[in-house]
């Protein structure tokens, strides 16, 4: 068999609420996977697994099944959305994020994602892991591959 | 209109738990974004906050009287209710329920408030 | 925890005189709000979200700050005005200032 190649490419939009009494910012993440078959047989996605991270905290989940078959030598862009909760122990983030006198409310996640596919009853597994900005402080679409974060401490490729 | 009105027992010995009641119409606390709290004037002193309980039955508590406190709420009667475990004479106050409007982080209106008095 | 300071404790006025009291908060806020005490009655919200005056309280109220430091104003004080007033934030483990006292001469 050859090669299912996964590609994060980022995040589509990000959908923003707030609850100001429990000072609780709710985002609706919809990230894109780009899934290409290299096989001259079909695969099916079986799963997508989501999490994401905001200092070290997990924020959000979510799990999609019997999502596509992809043909032969074929290519399907995925979308798939997290919703995340940035609870009052970070009621910090929540002045940040509300605070008008700031134009752009970017915050740093982590986007990890787990692919499984199938074919033939054999099962495989891709993951990914992917720094993004999202904003906080309103409902945004991006350009794919906009949010992406360079952290500059990451050695020059 | 809105109005709130708090309910207890005035005077309590050293140890007792405390059992208030806040009595409420004008709104309904199965209402998205409401919220109610106690908070509580010593004689002399000023205000402290206590509790707080959500529409939805979450609940959030002083720091450092959390091990102390039960806040819960009656939707139907149009209740909320404040137990405090092993008061002592610094629970000596006026304990006054107010409301939170819906998304709002301020206090709109406030119950006339109950006195309680600890001594032996 | 985040702690609201207010000063003065006390402050004695003559009527008409502008006078200001201050909130000081041990870390940085989006805003506060201020709430008034008469002797014997409920506490009355003033001042929401710093600024805003709230329905049927006077215009001689106004408020104002950023950060860690926040202040209500009364431009000609009247003798009803007499009571205790107390800032409070809610957005870090909800708190209120200590309180200030304000007495007619």
């Known amino acids: 068999p050859r090669s299912i190649d996964v590609k994060y490419i980022g995040v589509k939009s990000a959908y923003v609420s707030y609850d100001v009494q429990k000072r609780t910012i709710y985002l609706n993440i919809t990230n894109t996977l780009n899934i290409t078959n290299n096989n001259y047989y079909s695969v099916e996605v079986e799963n997508i697994t989501a999490q994401v991270q905001f200092s070290k905290t997990v924020i959000g989940k979510a799990r999609l099944n019997n999502i596509t078959i992809i043909g032969p030598l074929d290519m399907k862009q995925i979308d798939y959305t997290v919703p995340t909760v940035i609870a009052e122990e970070m009621s910090y983030m929540y002045d940040f994020c509300t605070l008008i006198s700031i134009k752009v409310h970017n915050i740093v996640l982590m986007m990890q994602v787990t692919v499984t596919t199938t074919y033939f009853g054999h099962s495989e597994q891709i993951s990914q892991e992917r720094y993004q900005y999202v904003d906080c402080g309103r409902n945004t679409t991006y350009q794919l591959g906009q949010s992406e974060y360079l952290n500059v401490l990451q050695p020059q490729q | 209109q809105v109005t709130l009105k708090e309910s207890g027992p005035g005077i309590l010995q050293p140890s007792q738990t405390l059992s208030l009641t806040c009595s409420f119409s004008?709104?309904?606390?199965?209402?998205?974004?409401?919220?109610v709290s106690w908070i509580r004037k010593p004689s002399g002193k000023g205000l402290e906050w206590l509790a707080h309980?959500?529409?939805?039955?979450?609940?959030r508590y002083n720091l450092f009287l959390k091990s102390r406190l039960t806040v819960s709420k009656d939707t139907s009667s149009n209740q909320v209710f404040l137990m405090i475990t092993s008061v002592d004479t610094t629970d000596t106050a006026t304990y006054y329920c107010?409301?939170?409007?819906?998304?709002?982080?301020?206090?709109?209106?406030w119950g006339q408030g109950t006195s309680l008095t600890v001594s032996s | 925890q985040i702690i609201l300071t207010q000063s003065p404790a006390i402050m004695s006025a003559s009527l008409g005189e502008e006078i200001t009291l201050t909130c000081s908060a041990s870390l940085s806020i989006s805003y506060v709000h201020w709430y008034q005490q008469k002797s014997g009655a409920s506490p009355k919200l003033l001042i929401y979200g710093t600024s805003n005056l709230a329905s049927g309280v006077p215009s001689r109220f106004s408020g104002s700050g950023s950060g860690t430091f926040y202040s209500l104003t009364i431009s000609s004080v009247e003798a009803e005005d007499a009571a205790d007033y107390y800032c409070h934030q809610w957005s870090i483990y909800r708190t209120f200032g200590g309180g200030t006292k304000l007495e007619m001469k």
């Open positions: 309980i959500f529409w939805d039955d979450d609940k």
């Open positions: 107010a409301r939170m409007g819906r998304q709002r982080d301020y206090f709109d209106y």
């Open positions: 004008g709104f309904s606390l199965s209402t998205s974004g409401m919220g």
